[in-house]
């Protein structure tokens, strides 16, 4: 049962981190700007993210702008969306291998092919957390570099926004998920079956018996 | 109370050299970059170029690139713009202004240059 | 370099007028801010980020627009107002440009 119960927590964990990782995508908070000083302008936070920015003005007023167009943005901006949606699209796919080799499901009936598949979805979730990690850490690189920025002033210095620590998060919970799903399975697929043939059972080769003939523990 | 005060305009003959200053008080000066915009006599407000007293970086409008030099003197809270190469169509009023939050929100009140043989 | 063009170049009005003047943009721009120059005089932040006002200025005066066009309302004209208006733009790239001006006159 413990080998069962890893995989619903490796999945657990990796569904969590792409929830994480579609809101960090999603919220306009990589980089948060604060300009607060002596000014005729109402203080501001201006909020920065892949796909908009927003201004916070003191009085609660937001107000959000999306990006419009496309060969105008940065070209770490444009490559960060990319990763962000990749790394997405690729944990969607590892959800789809884990359940086609899932215990509780029967798109696969082969034992090992199973074991094959759940350690396929889990090097994808690991991949996927990989591709969250790398937009991540390079927007923290981009703020913390922002000292030799000219447009960035000692007053108007950009801080890590929400999203980052959502984005680590996400990429934690992936490589966490991804990391269990490939421990729970064990070097060698048929060891389980074999065994269990082995001392129960002569009349039948393991190929022959049905998903359902053998208690759930013994499989990966 | 936030000041900009320009000095340093005048005559100056067709490819000479110019610098003008801009003294801020009232703030801190490396809080928030330093603009510089022209306005020839009776025409529109150009943008020149900006510089950050933190770090000393600076954005140019690629027109003004090469002949403009922007430059800070921390110890002084003063921004300068050198001039060179300096052209009849260089005439203008030269304004420094504060950035805050990408809005120009105080100005001096200019300083004129007059390119003139 | 994002175009700005202003409409009308100039305007007569008179006090208790409603005047609008428009700021277009040849691309759409990221900021869009308001100022008001009279003769002799520096340039004062009126509006800024398309519709806020800045403190000390009168509510009579109002922004709005997106992506590219933009409007200045003076809801009712007070002699104080007649000057020359110019819209600016901050997009992410400079160099950040001002529209040629509106002039406004007592008709």
């Known amino acids: 049962m413990a080998s069962a119960g890893m995989q619903i927590l490796g999945v657990v964990l990796t569904l969590l981190g792409w929830v994480n990782g579609l809101v960090s995508c999603a919220l306009p908070m990589w980089k948060v700007t604060a300009f607060i000083g002596n000014s005729i302008v109402v203080a501001q936070v201006v909020w920065e993210g892949l796909w908009m920015s927003c201004v916070v003005q003191s009085t609660g007023q937001m107000q959000c702008k999306v990006y419009d167009s496309l060969l105008a943005l940065p070209q770490d901006l444009q490559a960060a969306r990319a990763l962000c949606v990749i790394a997405l699209l690729v944990a969607l796919f590892g959800l789809l291998v884990y359940l086609a080799g899932a215990k509780c499901t029967t798109c696969v009936e082969e034992k090992d092919s199973k074991a094959r598949l759940v350690l396929t979805s889990g090097i994808v979730f690991v991949i996927s957390g990989v591709l969250t990690l790398i937009p991540v850490c390079w927007t923290a690189h981009a703020i913390i570099r922002d000292f030799y920025n000219p447009l960035v002033a000692e007053a108007q210095k950009r801080e890590l926004g929400a999203s980052l620590y959502l984005g680590w998060a996400a990429s934690g919970l992936l490589l966490l998920g991804g990391g269990l799903l490939c421990c729970t399975c064990p070097s060698g697929g048929s060891q389980g079956p074999s065994h269990y043939m082995a001392r129960y059972s002569t009349s039948a080769p393991a190929i022959s018996r049905g998903p359902s003939e053998y208690p759930t523990k013994n499989y990966v | 109370q936030v000041q900009l005060v320009e000095s340093g305009g005048g005559v100056v003959q067709p490819g000479g050299s110019l610098r003008l200053s801009c003294k801020a008080s009232g703030y801190s000066f490396t809080g928030y970059t330093m603009n510089w915009v022209r306005q020839a006599p009776g025409k529109g407000l150009e943008w020149v170029g900006l510089i950050n007293p933190y770090n000393g970086g600076t954005i140019y409008n690629q027109k003004f690139k090469g002949r403009f030099t922007l430059s800070v003197d921390k110890s002084k809270s003063t921004a300068y713009l050198q001039m060179n190469s300096l052209r009849a169509e260089d005439t203008a009023v030269y304004y420094c202004a504060r950035d805050y939050g990408f809005v120009l929100d105080y100005w001096g009140r200019g300083t004129l240059v007059t390119v003139s043989s | 370099d994002i175009q700005l063009t202003q409409s009308p170049s100039s305007l007569s009005a008179s006090v208790g007028d409603r005047v609008t003047i428009t700021c277009s943009a040849s691309?759409?721009?990221?900021?869009l801010h308001w100022f008001q120059q009279k003769p002799g005089k520096a340039p004062k932040l009126l509006v800024y980020s398309t519709s806020n006002l800045p403190s000390g200025v009168p509510s009579r005066f109002s922004g709005s627009g997106s992506g590219t066009d933009y409007t200045l309302t003076i809801s009712s004209l007070q002699p104080e107002d007649f000057a020359t208006y110019y819209c600016?733009?901050?997009?992410?790239?400079?160099?950040?440009?001002f529209g040629q001006g509106t002039k406004l006159e007592i008709k």
């Open positions: 600016q733009q901050r997009s992410i790239y400079p160099p950040w440009t």
């Open positions: 691309s759409s721009v990221s900021y």
